[in-house]
Structures are given as structure tokens and as C-alpha cells.
């Protein structure tokens, strides 16, 4: 039975040209995280595999940085980066958990960030 839940940074906004951290956290389960995939719509951004380390999709390598932790840092943001991002946790023995983040990249210098949580 899947008992875990994914906490995410929710809806967030950031300034064009800036950076943002996409962060998900799996809680309420003792399942082992074997891999986390980060996807934007249907495009793979990155994979963090427990055994193999990070894989960053080559088309994003110049502006995606691994971490912190299982999170992902997007740099040099453009308005085209606006959209849905998904963290997909592969766990054993539970299976797959998916979290959703919506990022809005603003032209304005006043980008109000959504609520964030702290991961210890």
C-alpha cells in the first residue's frame, strides 16, 4: 500500500534571467527512493539515480544544475520556462509518486515567490 505523500514548492514565480530551485520531498513512507525524474510537460530535464548519480538531459545541461539534494536548480530563466514541472519518485517497494510544481517566469522585477518549505 502506498502511504507516502509528496510535498512540493507548489506554485512559484521567478524573474526572467534569474534562477529557481524546484524541490519535492517524499514523506510518510519508509520506502527506499531509487530514482527521481524531473520532467517539464513531456520533456525529461534530469534524473537522480541512487546508484548512478545524476543524468542531466544534454539539451538543458547549460542551465540546469543538480540539487540541492534531490531537487533541481533552473538557471537563466526565460518566459518559455513557464509551465508545469513534475518530480517523479521511483520507490521500493511502494512504486511511483508524482509531485507537480507550476512555475511562472515574469518579465517584471517583482516576482513573488510561493510558500516554501524547509527540507532538513
Amino acid at each position: 500500500m502506498m502511504t507516502g505523500t509528496i510535498e512540493t514548492t507548489g506554485n512559484i514565480s521567478a524573474e526572467k534571467g534569474g534562477s529557481i530551485i524546484l524541490q519535492c520531498h517524499l514523506s510518510s513512507t519508509t520506502a527506499q527512493v531509487t530514482q527521481v525524474n524531473w520532467e517539464q510537460q513531456d520533456q525529461l530535464l534530469a534524473i537522480c539515480n541512487a546508484d548512478l548519480g545524476w543524468h542531466i538531459s544534454p539539451s538543458f545541461k547549460d542551465r540546469v544544475a543538480p540539487g540541492p539534494g534531490l531537487g533541481l536548480t533552473l538557471q537563466s530563466l526565460t518566459v518559455n520556462d513557464t509551465g508545469e514541472y513534475f518530480c517523479i519518485y521511483h520507490t521500493y517497494p511502494d512504486g511511483t509518486y508524482t509531485g507537480r510544481i507550476f512555475l511562472e517566469v515574469l518579465e517584471s522585477s517583482v516576482a513573488e515567490h510561493g510558500a516554501r518549505f524547509q527540507i532538513p
Epitope: T34, Q35, L44, I47, N49, D51, L52, G53, H55, S57, P58, S59, K61, H90, Y92, G95, T96
Partner: antibody
Framework: EVQLVQSGAEVKKPGASVKVSCKAS????????MHWVRQAPGQGLEWIGR????????KYNEKFKTRVTMTVDTSTSTAYMELSSLRSEDTAVYYC????????????WGQGTLVTVSS | DIQMTQSPSSLSASVGDRVTITCRAS??????LAWYQQKPGKAPKLLIY???TLAEGVPSRFSGSGSGTDFTLTISSLQPEDFATYYC?????????FGGGTKVEIK
């Protein structure tokens, strides 16, 4: 056109080391991890490890961890795999292979380097 | 470690035949499976990744299916150049294990 060109065949004595090179062309070398895979005569394929040419971080198969060293020279877009304390069962064709764009599979392979370990 | 088991280990077929090769993982690997073709004295060539995505330049007669533990490579109409050994590989966990191979020979 993506190409991975490996160094020539080697004959080594047991206990020695071998260093195989893999020169990449046709793509941005630092954007793709490089893997090494070997194949003993008449046998299947066995993964040795991977190296990130950008950060030089590496991950090795536990089986080879104490004997393998992977390095890169970004100025020449060349990856190297050194295996030490060679034994007869290390006789194999060694391949470099580029990591795919969407995961840890191998989309381009070198032609292979035969390493023979014999006394 | 996850083990990959291919069957059959060899098969004989004729040009034009439909050929199916299976690969079984010892536990759930989702869709993280690749297929390679290898001809004697040559390096392997990627055919399929993520269980069903055809690699660039691979003819459409090759197809992959399956998820979880059971996977299939199908060649819809075997061509002379398809006689080779085929390997499956789990591509999301150390030590990135390969199956033992399936040799497709001419009948």
C-alpha cells in the same frame, strides 16, 4: 556525425595495468557522460562504469571499484579507462559508449579495444 | 542486483519471418529497458530505449513493448541484415545489467 575512436589492441601480463583511450568527435564532449563496457570472448556485455567529462565525477561497478580509474582530457575530447592488477579473466573487448540523452543507456559506441592478458 | 534473463538464447528464422525475443527482469524496472543489436566483431548498436522508443535511424520493423518485469523485442519482417545477437539492458540501476543475449540465426 558522432564518432568514438578507441586505441589499438593491447597484450598485457597478469598483474600489469592497461589504459584504453576513446576520442570523441561530432558532439559537445562535456554534455554527455561516457561509459565503459566490456565483453569477454564469446560472452555477454558487462558495465564497468561512467564518467562525467564536465565535472570528472565518476561511478563504478562495485566489481571493478578497486581496480578501475576513469579520466578525461577535455582539451582533446578523450576519455580514458585504466584497469590495474590484470588477470586472465580480464581478457575482453573494452568499449567506450556515450550515455543517451534520456537516461543511462548507450546511444553511440566505440569500435572496441581487445585487451589480452596472458603470461 | 537486478538480473535480466533473455529467451530464447538462440533461434533460427527465415527472411520475412516475424521474430519475438523476450527479456525478463528479476524485479520491477518500470520502462527502463534498452535493446541492442550486435554483429560479429562489431560494437553493439542501440535499437530501443525506454522499452518502446526507437533510436534514431532504426528501421520501423523493430519495436519494443512491455513494462514492469516482462519485455519484448519484435522484428516484424526479418531482413538479411538482422541476423545478429540481441541484448536487453536495464538502464536505470547499477550495475546497468545486460541480458545474456539472443542469437538470431538463418534457418
Amino acid at each position: 556525425e558522432v564518432q568514438l575512436v578507441q586505441s589499438g589492441a593491447e597484450v598485457k601480463k597478469p598483474g600489469a595495468s592497461v589504459k584504453v583511450s576513446c576520442k570523441a568527435s561530432g558532439y559537445t564532449f562535456t554534455n554527455y557522460w561516457m561509459h565503459w563496457v566490456r565483453q569477454a570472448p564469446g560472452q555477454g556485455l558487462e558495465w564497468i562504469g561512467r564518467i562525467d567529462p564536465d565535472s570528472t565525477g565518476s561511478k563504478y561497478n562495485e566489481k571493478f571499484k578497486t581496480r578501475v580509474t576513469m579520466t578525461v582530457d577535455t582539451s582533446t575530447s578523450t576519455a580514458y579507462m585504466e584497469l590495474s592488477s590484470l588477470r586472465s579473466e580480464d581478457t575482453a573487448v573494452y568499449y567506450c559508449a556515450r550515455e543517451g540523452a534520456y537516461g543511462y543507456y548507450f546511444d553511440y559506441w566505440g569500435q572496441g579495444t581487445l585487451v589480452t592478458v596472458s603470461s | 542486483d537486478i538480473q535480466m534473463t533473455q529467451s530464447p538464447s538462440s533461434l533460427s528464422a527465415s527472411v520475412g519471418d516475424r521474430v519475438t525475443i523476450t527479456c525478463r527482469a528479476s524485479e520491477n524496472i518500470y520502462s527502463y529497458l534498452a535493446w541492442y543489436q550486435q554483429k560479429p566483431g562489431k560494437a553493439p548498436k542501440l535499437l530501443i530505449y525506454n522499452a518502446r522508443t526507437l533510436a534514431e535511424g532504426v528501421p520501423s520493423r523493430f519495436s519494443g513493448s512491455g513494462s514492469g518485469t516482462d519485455f519484448t523485442l519484435t522484428i516484424s519482417s526479418l531482413q538479411p541484415e538482422d541476423f545478429a545477437t540481441y541484448y536487453c539492458q536495464y538502464h536505470s540501476g547499477s550495475p546497468l545489467p545486460f541480458g545474456g543475449g539472443t542469437k538470431v540465426e538463418i534457418k
